[in-house]
Amino acid sequence: EEELQVIQPDKSVSVAAGESAILHCTVTSLIPVGPIQWFRGAGPARELIYNQKEGHFPRVTTVSESTKRENMDFSISISNITPADAGTYYCVKFRKGSPDTEFKSGAGTELSVRAKPSAPVVSGPAARATPQHTVSFTCESHGFSPRDITLKWFKNGNELSDFQTNVDPVGESVSYSIHSTAKVVLTREDVHSQVICEVAHVTLQGDPLRGTANLSETIRVPPTLEVTQQPVRAENQVNVTCQVRKFYPQRLQLTWLENGNVSRTETASTVTENKDGTYNWMSWLLVNVSAHRDDVKLTCQVEHDGQPAVSKSHDLKVSAHPKEQGSNTAAENTGSNERNIYGGSG
């Protein structure tokens, strides 16, 4: 009888993570008597995957009827494949003895595992930044195999080009990770903007995974201030308003100063929202001019989102007949809210 040969017909097998892998092996003879064993890897450090003779291998089942001697098919199925199962598997015939001795090995079957990348996680800077500044976003995805992967960045559907991507490790591994950093220039209109990281991989069948970051968590739009004097409401009373426009986020505190002395402090609450996501807010100050002998310098001071205060002043002439006066704008942006504040004397 011809000497036994161990035939592993498949040089390689590719399986998706979570599925079962079938590794084929047949022998050409019933002799010598002795067990078949499957190993992952070769040499002294090889890992026993299945032993026909003994042992408990919960993930391994024999594909064909193993209770018949004439069966020469020693194919196995390994369930619930993970990237850690990747490697070359050898079907080995042993000759019965003490100890059993290796008689002949198959040529090996390389098992590669297709593993999906994890959902991309996009993270932005730790601190908010203002328009015209460049900020960095990172995107990470892990656990995929094979190594080939494509990553793209978008801002509101427009592809970005200023980014750097690394796939680790560089050498062979059971699975890989991707890390990318993109640079984005902020504009005042970015409150509603999104940055998207898109990952395409063979396991995703043309349906890429996306991770997003809202620029609303990154941007700070400073308010612009405008202080104006309204027509006289009553004899000796002047209404001064401070318009706080186009600011974001909403966190804002306003203080009225009369000749440098704090008159009133309030926090923006009932704001109005602009289409671009920024906020507007208005504060009134009712000034009793008869209580003042000299001109009054009214200052609207705004502290936005923990930043240094910005202010806008208005000179109120007490000698002249009250009439509407204008004022310039200053600093930042974001918000909307109308609320009456009655301050001053009398």
Epitope: L30, I31, V33, G34, K53, E54, G97, S98
Partner: antibody, heavy 118, light 107 residues
């Protein structure tokens, strides 16, 4: 059903010959190593002979040169030709199938009695 | 030839008892050891192969262990039908050899 049925036992004089048969059913005999085991009255079990799937044969020392094991695939049968029989060959002879991959005995026949006496 | 020595040669026990029979090989036989049960006038029945694997249909009250030269057969809770003679056998190399047997009797 997997089954082994022995036949051919009987009374024979010392120096005589006997041919034991074992008919297999439920499996292909040629795919398995097959064995003969005997048990003298009131004694333990003794392995006698085996034939491998390639036709290779094995014997215990006391029967070597006197007994011949063979099989006939067409009849799915195993045989033991016993010549120059001695009184100490008196025993129940069992036909036994070797296991799937390690030749561990798994199926036994009911046995046939061989008595060597003058 | 490899010699197989069983002990004890006979053993008295009661229904419900747990009993252990030992078998020693004169040289290393890996785990190519089988256990058989035989009742008077009947053919032996295969219980265990490769020292610890149960043949199909054999109840789990039978268990085997060991490797190399020392082996044991344990019956966890004796029932009336378990009183019989038990044999060990090495089948690592020809000639295959049996132990002399252990007769398990009702006390």
């Amino acid at each position: 059903e997997v089954q082994l049925v022995e036949s051919g036992g009987g009374l024979v004089q010392p120096g005589g010959s006997l041919r034991l048969s074992c008919a297999a059913s439920g499996f292909t005999l040629s795919s398995y190593d097959m064995h003969w085991v005997r048990q003298a009255p009131g004694k333990g079990l003794e392995w006698v002979s085996a034939i491998g799937t390639a036709g290779d044969t094995y014997y215990t020392g006391s029967v070597k040169g006197r007994f011949t094991i063979s099989r006939e695939n067409a009849k799915n049968s195993l045989y033991l030709q016993m010549n120059s029989l001695r009184a100490e060959d008196t025993a129940v002879y069992y036909c036994v199938r070797g296991g799937v991959w390690d030749d561990a005995f798994d199926i036994w026949g009911q046995g046939t009695m061989v008595t060597v006496s003058s | 030839d490899i010699q197989m020595t069983q002990s004890p040669s006979s053993l008295s026990a009661s229904v419900g008892d747990r009993v252990t029979i030992t078998c020693r090989a004169s040289q290393d036989i890996n785990n190519y050891l089988a256990w058989f049960q035989q009742k008077p006038g009947k053919a032996p029945k295969s219980l265990i192969y490769t020292a610890s694997s149960l043949h199909s249909g054999v109840p789990s009250k039978f268990s085997g262990s060991g490797s190399g030269t020392d082996f044991t057969l344990t019956i966890s809770s004796l029932q009336p039908e378990d009183f019989a003679t038990y044999y060990c056998q090495q089948y690592v190399s020809y000639p295959y050899t049996f132990g002399q047997g252990t007769k398990l009797e009702i006390k």
